[in-house]
């Protein structure tokens, strides 16, 4: 199948369900990264940490994991925090097999999402509840704010960043007028001076098999930077694409299997079949990366209980004109490549 069974909890930021319990902060702002990324053992992904800061070697099966040190996404691993109640701070990388969960006496089916309180959205994956915060705490506004503080706002669920030197903030042009959101009752405040921003999708977290790609966008009711994620699979790990390169050619930029198949994820199966295209390989020193792509929504049906949908990278064409440097991270120098522009929508 095109997507190996693996949960989307691979990028969830672990969060406590008990709001009163203190828990260590694994992410520091601003980011502090070593000058050069680590060298990972063969077969271990070099990925961006859960803080969206530094390159790390992904944690493997049985390794400890945190919101910063995340498990290898393309090996179908997720961070099991069940042994660290009630803090849910340090977990162990575990493999998905796809069973249900019980939390506070309530049974949830594998793949089911629910909200235990206003601050977290949780998903049951293989007997373990993985949670992602609804109160996203992006980095403080570093450009203009010299004294940011994280405070609890009366009457609101989520804490907010406030700036003690608010008067120094430059006035911004109203490029995204969120009055339309306000009219629909989606927001409590009006954010009229909001510059709409959506970052490009990050490169897929792995060069073969299932990975994760993320981006930051403030195109939402609160004009608040939020992380979006999508599943990605640049090429299957178990197919030798070089065997498919035509005689006389150096590359096969796009590999497309003959038959359509269902995507599978955490034991759940897509409601329709797909015949995806994958990026291929070259025999010379070039790497193939997505060039023309889009994001599609794939609906999954689970054996027991409700289904769910996930955003998935859909590749239409790949570009093969970058030199391959680090076998673990072929996309490290992508942004500096002048002719490359992925279509990201």
């Amino acid at each position: 199948t095109a997507l190996s069974p693996t949960p989307t909890t691979m990028t969830f930021t672990p969060a406590p369900l008990e709001e009163t319990t203190t828990r260590p902060e694994f992410c520091k702002w601003p980011c502090e990264c070593p000058q050069s990324p680590p060298r990972c053992p063969l077969g271990v992904s070099l990925i961006t940490d859960g803080c969206e800061c530094c390159k790390i070697c992904a944690q493997q099966l049985g390794d400890n994991c945190t919101e910063a040190a995340i498990c290898d996404p393309h090996r179908g691993l997720y961070c099991d925090y069940s042994g660290d109640r009630p803090r849910y701070a340090i977990g162990v990388c575990a493999q998905v097999v796809g069973v249900g969960c019980v939390l506070d006496g309530v049974r949830y089916t594998n793949g089911e999402s629910f909200q235990p309180n206003c601050r977290y959205n949780c998903t049951c994956i293989d007997g373990t509840v993985g949670c992602t915060p609804l109160c996203l705490s992006p980095r403080p506004p570093r450009l203009w704010c010299r004294q940011p503080r994280h405070v609890r706002v009366p009457g609101q669920c989520c804490e907010q960043w406030v700036c003690d030197d608010d008067a120094r903030r430059p006035r911004q042009t109203a490029l995204l007028d969120t009055r339309a959101f306000a009219a629909s009752g989606a927001v409590e405040q009006r954010y009229e001076n909001c510059i709409a921003y959506t970052s490009p999708w990050s490169p897929c977290s792995t060069t073969c098999g299932l990975g994760i790609s993320t981006r930051i966008s403030n195109v939402n009711a609160r004009c608040w930077p939020e992380q979006e994620s999508r599943l990605c699979n640049l090429r299957p790990c178990d197919v030798d694409i070089q065997l498919h390169i035509k005689a006389g050619k150096k590359c096969l930029a796009v590999y497309q299997p003959e038959e359509a198949t269902n995507f599978t994820l955490a034991g759940c199966v897509s409601t329709r079949t797909y015949r995806p295209k994958y990026c291929g390989v070259c025999t010379d020193n070039r790497c193939c990366i997505p060039y023309k792509s889009k994001t599609i929504s794939v609906d999954f049906q689970c054996p027991e209980g409700p289904g769910f949908s996930r955003q998935v990278l859909w590749i239409n064409a790949c570009f093969c004109n970058l030199s391959c440097r680090n076998p673990n991270d072929i996309f490290a120098d992508l942004e500096s490549y002048p002719d490359f522009e992925e279509i990201a929508n």
Epitope: C251, C282, K292, F319, C320
Partner: antibody, heavy 121, light 108 residues
């Protein structure tokens, strides 16, 4: 229905450059590629260049290498063809045409109306 | 480079006639061949791809056949709107993609 609308006719001096645009509607550059074909007055069709889906790179006809640059702007679904160091032999109608991004399918499904480039002294 | 040679370079025919145009490739291209129609002052239009598949909206009086190095385009029961120049194009996986020199179908 896929439509390609090209920029207007150009008169250029010998040695100058010309940039022709081609705006796609009815589809997106995510699903197909734009290639460029030219036709000198009273002559046949001559392929110039475009994105080769199988090789994963923009390829050019030998005759035009180093002189032509083909680019695509996905945000506006517009493609461009930039031809440098024009000579009188470059006087021609320049067409953009679509190729579906499907392996082994190098057929030009839809064509722009053409842009006449005249090179004068 | 694969060279394409069309014959004849021009043909005179009447409405209702059947016209056959041939195209030879300098080396084998399997069935990777397309035929285009071009009228004066207009852009070419795709008629047939894959040597024999009719492009959408093309009348069934147009048909194509052949493989390897020898291909034909047949227009049965020629209509007034069919008087034009026809080009073959090799569409194998290797650039450059080359066209034949064209065959002009004229009114007799």
């Amino acid at each position: 229905e896929v439509q390609l609308v090209q920029s207007g006719a150009e008169v250029k001096r010998s040695g100058a450059s010309v940039k022709v645009s081609c705006k796609l509607s009815g589809d997106t550059l995510t699903d197909l590629s734009i290639h460029w074909v030219r036709q000198a007055p009273g002559k046949g069709l001559e392929w110039m260049g475009g994105f080769d889906f199988e090789d994963g790179e923009i390829v050019y006809g030998d005759k035009f290498k180093g002189r032509v640059t083909v680019t695509e702007d996905p945000s506006t679904d517009t493609a461009y063809m930039d031809l440098k160091r024009l000579t009188f032999e470059d006087t021609a109608i320049y067409y953009c045409a679509t190729i579906k991004d499907i392996p082994g399918r190098y057929y030009f499904d839809f064509w722009g109306q053409g842009t006449l480039v005249t090179v004068s002294s | 480079v694969i060279w394409m040679t069309q014959s004849p370079s021009s043909v005179s025919a009447s409405v209702g006639d059947t016209v056959t145009i041939t195209c030879r490739a300098s080396q084998g291209i399997r069935s990777w061949l397309a035929w285009y129609q071009q009228k004066p002052g207009k852009a070419p239009k795709l008629l047939i791809y894959g040597a024999s598949s009719l492009h959408s909206g093309v009348p069934s009086r147009f048909s194509g056949s052949g493989s390897g190095t020898y291909f034909t385009l047949t227009i049965s029961s020629l209509q007034p709107e069919d008087f034009a120049t026809y080009y073959c194009q090799q569409a194998d996986s290797f650039p450059p993609w080359t066209f034949g020199q064209g065959t002009k179908v004229e009114i007799k």
